[in-house]
């Protein structure tokens, strides 16, 4: 079974200090709910510098089907992968042989997920089994985050420059994966 990519585009975002990006269209719906006033998550302040415009972070969009065992989503989902190392734009490596932008003792900014969203999927299963309703966790936005020596480096492994080349059969996630996350396989590589 081949996996079909419908869309694969990269958008470079240059967040501003204190800006809280608008939710993606998938977050909009007409459900009637008891919403809490000002109940959304607070804006992050990802940078500790005045020259915010020099920092950038890329959001790569991939549209694909997701699978759970023998079952496959009825429709593809569009997910976002955070890519790149955040640094002064003029110093970001863009040619072979360019060195990294930061000093050994300087702060390390990384492009990592900022917020997550849920999307409903209907999984179609073979053998006449009833469709399964599930909700998948997708990255809603990326941010440049300043790392300190207290950060667990393992949580960043999926979100460095390697994130631009998503791994086969795995959904990039920070920290440990749940047992169920390990079952969430993609049908093929990008």
């Amino acid at each position: 079974q081949g996996w079909q990519a419908f869309k694969n585009d990269a958008t470079e975002i240059i967040p501003e200090l204190g800006e809280y990006p608008e939710p993606p269209p998938e977050l909009e719906n007409n459900k009637t709910m008891n919403r809490a006033e000002n109940g959304g998550r607070p804006p992050h302040h990802p940078f500790e510098t005045k020259d915010v415009s020099e920092y950038s972070c890329r959001e790569l969009h991939f549209t694909r089907y997701v699978t759970d065992g023998p079952c496959r989503s009825a429709k593809p989902v569009t997910e976002l992968v955070c890519s790149g190392q955040c640094g002064p734009a003029r110093l970001l490596p863009n040619a072979i042989g360019r060195g990294k932008w930061w000093r050994p003792s300087g702060p390390d900014f990384r492009c990592i997920p900022d917020r997550y969203r849920a999307q409903r999927v209907q999984l179609l299963c073979p053998g006449g089994e009833a469709p399964r309703a599930r909700k998948v966790r997708l990255v809603a936005s990326c941010k440049c985050k300043r790392l300190t020596r207290f950060h667990n480096q393992s949580e960043l492994k999926d979100f460095g420059t390697e994130a631009a080349r998503p791994q086969k059969g795995r959904k990039p996630r920070p920290r440990a994966r749940s047992a169920k996350a390990n079952q969430a396989e993609l049908e093929n590589a990008y």
Epitope: N29, A36, R117, A130, K135, R175, A179
Partner: antibody, heavy 121, light 109 residues
Framework: EVQLVQSGAEVKKPGASVKVSCKVS????????MHWVRQAPGKGLEWMGG????????IYAQKFQGRVTMTEDTSTDTAYMELSSLRSEDTAVYYC??????????????WGPGTLVTVSS | QAVVTQEPSLTVSPGGTVTLTCGSS?????????PYWFQQKPGQAPRTLIS???DKHSWTPARFSGSLLGGKAALTLSGAQPEDEAEYYC?????????FGGGTKLTVL
Amino acid sequence: EVQLVQSGAEVKKPGASVKVSCKVSGYTLSELSMHWVRQAPGKGLEWMGGFDPEVGELIYAQKFQGRVTMTEDTSTDTAYMELSSLRSEDTAVYYCATDAGGFWYKFFQHWGPGTLVTVSS
Amino acid sequence: QAVVTQEPSLTVSPGGTVTLTCGSSTGAVTSGHYPYWFQQKPGQAPRTLISDTNDKHSWTPARFSGSLLGGKAALTLSGAQPEDEAEYYCLLFYGGTVVFGGGTKLTVL
């Protein structure tokens, strides 16, 4: 693995407010969907509200609208639930519960130990 | 607001099979209600057994299974053990709102 630690037991007078905290470790709070559930002595579970990742907002059960405030401090990975205008029937164990952080959303997978709130004059 | 109904109490013999059900006042329960099942023993926090109709967790014993049965969510226990004696709660999603059932006290006797 997600772990939840809640604040200690509280004794309050009718009309007062109580604020219960729930500290997350193992994941960051912004990755998770935190909910609050209470259980009166000898009674069943009652959902109070929580973070709905489909709309990106905290939502409350209609019964508690106007009386409950849920907040999340992502800098300390701590969630708070404040209930005001307490009555004797609010005496209950208050639980925080969250999903496991996997690719598939599995809500209420990890539970805090509970915080007993006693409302008595 | 919707009301979620469960049998108040059920009894099963050790090694026997029992099915707990979870109904909705709004009509048939579907997979779109994402039925959850919890087990709670006295003095303990609830523990999730089943998510999204039939998904077991790593700690869920194989003798528990979830399904949809006659317009209700169902939790079937096959080969009951003494340690399965507990209160069982179901939960249904209605849009963004969540409603718990009243609970079923299961006795293994």
